[in-house]
């Protein structure tokens, strides 16, 4: 009788993580008697998978009932596979002996791969806002998946970015995998509403990427442009001076109005009106008694914007003139008003 | 000579079920698995799972697990499978094949003629 | 899955001269014991698929010389050195290292 040969049909089993491996065996003869033993690996490290003769294996089922008479089927079923279970399973005949077994033959190997989604992509910014026209940094991580071949793309509001570098890690054979991104985008003032989008496409994904976002608005600040301007005259000895914050992001800001260098009053803007573009713009006004001042009044409007060192904007206040005229056009204009930016 | 013969075309209603039967003749039908196979119009051949005529085991492929049920009836040396739910995508030629394996290989030596199943409301 | 592409899709032939098929694998078919794992079938109108070739290059029995296989890891070609009437049908490559076991989509050979 011919010897008895130990099949494994399949050179290689694809399955995706979670579901369940069947690995085939089957022997052409029902002699020698004895157990088959399932393990993973070859030589003295090898890893029991499963045992026909003892042993708890929980994940393990048989594909047909082992006890039968003339079964020559020692297939088996691993369930809830995970990228850990990957490497190549053989089915090993052993013959009956005293006191132990004696393996007698085994199969050439089934090689289990394994293939594990990309976790959800996490695109993380810098840790300080930044201004337009600087150049900021993004990362994107994704893990746990397998096969190790892997597409990144970066985009700003839909336009694919070229500017960034991926490494996937390990280099070597693993598992599972990792892979990490770090992409340069450079701020404009209109960015406030921008996205940046981390794409990760994958054959588990089956041509649906996954995505990570990031908003620029957690990223960008937009500093203020002040203008002050002179309004009509209130009253007789009253004129009313207003500070116009344009275009600023975010909206934590703080407003000190000084008079001659001395502080009037300090407020935080509240009531803001947003534009299109996602900035913000304030206005906070000071009622100024001229009679109360004997010289020219220097109005100095001094914003503090998003905790960045004070931007001021002042304006001269002639009293000694004219001042019944104060209050008209032509005298409004911003007589020697000049920008003072403090760093 | 080896031979599979298919059951004749079946026309079913969505939702319906469908079994088709491959008889072996010609060699021991317990010394070889039976793979069934399908082909959409227009489509390359599409792998469904197979049984073990010498145990009754299966496997399927993930995606008709759920739907598919392959046994066998080694008296009349015959195989079956069944799929239920029947969807209009599953409109195909369905074929079984015996797999026959040396030490290094196993390919498909032998095909059945086929059953073309329609599914049709 | 391996993914099996074939190329042409459809091929006129002449009878007594040479034709071609391509078939890629999105991966090695190549296993470490040296051996292509991919398969060639015929199904000629009105019957059963038939096995050509397997492993890459070999002939399956009562199966003419003048079907030839050839091709490693990801490229396979199968040659007819010359083409007879009765060679004509669908050619489809399958893979056969991997379960699940896939297949290219066919290239239909018929007489110009």
């Known amino acids: 009788e011919e010897e008895l040969q130990v099949i494994q049909p399949d050179k290689s089993v694809l399955v995706a993580a979670g579901e369940t491996a069947t690995l085939r065996c089957t022997a052409t003869s029902l002699i020698p008697v004895g157990p088959i033993q399932w393990f993973r690996g070859a030589g003295p490290g090898r890893e029991l998978i499963y045992n026909q003769k003892e042993g708890h294996f929980p994940r393990v089922t048989t594909v047909s009932d082992l006890t039968k008479r003339n079964n020559m089927d020692f297939s088996i079923r691993i369930g809830n596979i995970t990228p850990a279970d990957a490497g190549t399973y053989y089915c090993v005949k052993f013959r009956k002996g005293s006191p132990d077994d004696v393996e007698f033959k085994s199969g050439a190997g089934t090689e289990l791969s394994v293939r594990a989604k990309p976790s959800a992509p996490v695109v993380s910014g810098p840790a300080a806002r930044a201004t337009p026209q600087h150049t900021v940094s993004f990362t994107c991580e994704s893990h746990g998946f397998s096969p190790r071949d892997i597409t990144l793309k970066w985009f700003k509001n839909g336009n694919e970015l070229s500017d960034f570098q991926t490494n996937v890690d390990p280099v070597g054979e693993s598992v599972s995998y990792s892979i990490h991104s770090t992409a340069k985008v450079v701020l404009t003032r209109e960015d406030v509403h921008s996205q940046v989008i981390c794409e990760v496409a994958h054959v588990t994904l089956q041509g649906d990427p996954l995505r990570g976002t990031a908003n620029l608005s957690e990223t960008i600040r937009v500093p203020p442009t002040l203008e002050v301007t002179q309004q009509p005259v209130r009253a007789e000895n009253q004129v009313n001076v207003t500070c116009q914050v344009r275009k600023f992001y975010p909206q934590r800001l703080q407003l000190t109005w000084l008079e001659n260098g001395n502080v009037s009053r300090t407020e935080t803007a509240s009531t803001v009106t947003e534009n299109k573009d996602g900035t913000y713009n304030w206005m906070s006004w000071l009622l100024v008694n001229v009679s109360a001042h004997r010289d020219d009044v220097k109005l100095t409007c001094q914003v503090e914007h998003d905790g960045q060192p004070a931007v001021s904007k002042s304006h001269d206040l002639k009293v000694s003139a004219h001042p019944k005229e104060q209050g008209s056009n032509t005298a409004a204009e911003n007589t020697g008003s000049n920008e003072r930016n403090i760093y | 000579q080896v031979q599979l013969v298919q059951s004749g075309a079946e026309v079913k209603k969505p939702g319906a079920s469908v079994k088709v039967s491959c008889k072996a003749s010609g060699y021991t039908f317990t010394g070889y698995y039976i793979f069934w196979m399908r082909q959409a119009p227009g489509q390359g051949l599409e792998w469904m799972g197979w049984?073990?005529?010498?145990?009754?085991?299966?496997d399927y492929a993930q995606k008709f697990q759920g739907r598919v049920t392959m046994t066998m009836d080694t008296s009349i040396s015959t195989a079956y499978m069944e799929l239920s739910r029947l969807r209009s995508d599953d409109t195909a030629v369905y074929y079984c094949?015996?797999?026959?394996?040396?030490?290094?290989?196993?390919?498909?030596?032998?095909w059945g003629q086929g059953t073309l199943v329609t599914v049709s409301s | 899955d391996i993914v099996m592409t074939q190329s042409p899709l459809s091929l006129p032939v002449t009878p007594g001269e040479p034709a071609s098929i391509s078939c890629r694998s999105s991966q090695s078919l190549l296993h470490s014991n040296g051996y292509n794992y991919l398969d060639w079938y015929l199904q000629k109108p009105g019957q059963s698929p038939q096995l050509l070739i397997y492993l890459g290059s070999n002939r399956a029995s009562g199966v003419p010389d003048r079907f030839s296989g050839s091709g490693s890891g990801t490229d396979f070609t199968l040659k007819i050195s010359r083409v007879e009437a009765e060679d004509v049908g669908v050619y489809c490559c399958m893979q056969a290292l991997q379960t699940p076991r896939t297949f290219g989509q066919g290239t239909k050979v018929e007489i110009k």
């Open positions: 094949a015996r797999e026959d394996c040396t030490s290094i290989s196993c390919s498909f030596d032998y």
């Open positions: 049984i073990n005529p010498n145990s009754g085991g299966t």
